[in-house]
């Protein structure tokens, strides 16, 4: 139930995919990743107003209860709905390997 | 990679399962759900400090980048890792039906 994609807070303010450039040092990977030297990290950032990109029934419940009890129940949160794989060249105990990570880069976002 | 389950902020402050009692009116369901009259909604609430219950590599990246750029990159967020199904007795166009919802109640939480 991916509800409305219209952001009532104004363009770009609601939950969506952002790209953040990060070095291996930024990521804390310099000691085990050889390549790439820099990653364009895609991540989900933004507000989740009522029913915006609600991932499922649970997100809809959370929205309702947050409206009633904002100090107890947080608003839904902008998180990845799916991921893009990425391959890293990394140091291993036995040398160097190519390794694919399936859960590294956000592909699509929703509110939950 | 479900990292540490020790909460550095003190007992019960970090991401975990909470139960919130809600009526059909609270949930906005009074016009289409007949039973139950009240739901013990299990949801994920709490802080996600560094590496606490990190769901995957993406969550670990988010932690690192949040530390570097707290105004740009939010901390990981406490969300359901899995759900418990729940059956509702609901009104339909043709009468009344029993319907199972698989994404209504959080079963387990992680940070992402």
């Amino acid at each position: 139930a991916r509800n409305g994609d219209h952001c009532p807070l104004g363009p770009g303010r609601c939950c969506r995919l952002h790209t953040v450039r990060a070095s291996l040092e930024d990521l804390g990977w310099a000691d085990w990743v050889l390549s790439p030297r820099e990653v364009q990290v895609t991540m989900c950032i933004g507000a989740c107003p009522s029913q915006f990109r609600a991932a499922n029934m649970h997100a809809q419940i959370k929205t309702s209860l947050h409206r009633l009890k904002p100090d107890t129940v947080p608003a839904p949160c902008c998180v990845p709905a799916s991921y893009n794989p990425m391959v890293l060249i990394q140091k291993t105990d036995t040398g160097v390997s190519l390794q694919t990570y399936d859960d590294l880069l956000a592909k699509d976002c929703h509110c939950i | 990679a479900r990292n540490g389950d020790h909460c550095p902020l003190g007992p019960g402050r970090c991401c975990r399962l909470h139960t919130v009692r809600a009526s059909l009116e609270d949930l906005g369901w009074a016009d289409w759900v007949l039973s139950p009259r009240e739901v013990q909604v299990t949801m994920c609430i709490g802080a996600c400090p560094s590496q606490f219950r990190a769901a995957n590599m993406h969550a670990q990246i988010k932690t690192s980048l949040h530390r570097l750029k707290p105004d740009t990159v939010p901390a990981p967020c406490c969300v359901p890792a899995s759900y418990n199904p729940m059956v509702l007795i609901q009104k339909t166009d043709t009468g009344v039906s029993l319907q199972t919802y698989d994404d209504l109640l959080a079963k387990d939480c992680h940070c992402i």
Partner: antibody, heavy 121, light 107 residues
Framework: QVQLVQSGAEVKKPGASVKVSCKAS????????IIWVRQAPGQGLEWMGW????????VYAQKLQGRVTMTTDTSTSTAYMELRSLRSDDTAVYYC??????????????WGQGTLVTVSS | DIQMTQSPSSVSASVGDRVTITCRAS??????LAWYQQKPGKAPKLLIY???SLQSGVPSRFSGSGSGTDFTLTISSLQPEDFATYYC?????????FGGGTKVEIK
Amino acid sequence: QVQLVQSGAEVKKPGASVKVSCKASGYTFASYDIIWVRQAPGQGLEWMGWISALSGDTVYAQKLQGRVTMTTDTSTSTAYMELRSLRSDDTAVYYCARTRHDTSGIRFDYWGQGTLVTVSS
Amino acid sequence: DIQMTQSPSSVSASVGDRVTITCRASQGIDSWLAWYQQKPGKAPKLLIYAASSLQSGVPSRFSGSGSGTDFTLTISSLQPEDFATYYCQQVHSFPITFGGGTKVEIK
């Protein structure tokens, strides 16, 4: 513009060694890794190995392990491939190529012109 | 090691023809596949990477598709300069491996 210029053709006797150079220009050498590929006459492409231009870490094809050494010299933006104990079946054109690695994966976007190494008694 | 099998090994075609070359990996390689074109006496040239992304400067008549184990390179309308040998290559794991090549010849 990006260029990889390799050293000239070599004729070697069996048992000898050869060292092929690959000089890079038009980009920051240490930011892109290098692979070496060879092609025997009338045959397909065979990957020989990879070297990090920054750290010098290497990965070699199993069949060449112990006979091949890849190095880089960042001060001259040059990569080297040395092959020892040459045999007649090492006769091939040897290529270096620049490695492009980002979120779209790995590919080899610029290639040297190739160096013909002939092993003959 | 991951084996890459290309078919056909050669194909005869005319200018304007649609040409399809397939590449099969011996195990799943996600979308970590590239296609190269090689002309006699020349170095290989990158055409497609990440299975379907067109390298900058490569004509749009070249396209790639597939993921997992089965991949395709398509030339939508063969041009005179396209007669060459084409290689697929997996960059999923070391050792990096190439297919045996497909020679596109003039009919």
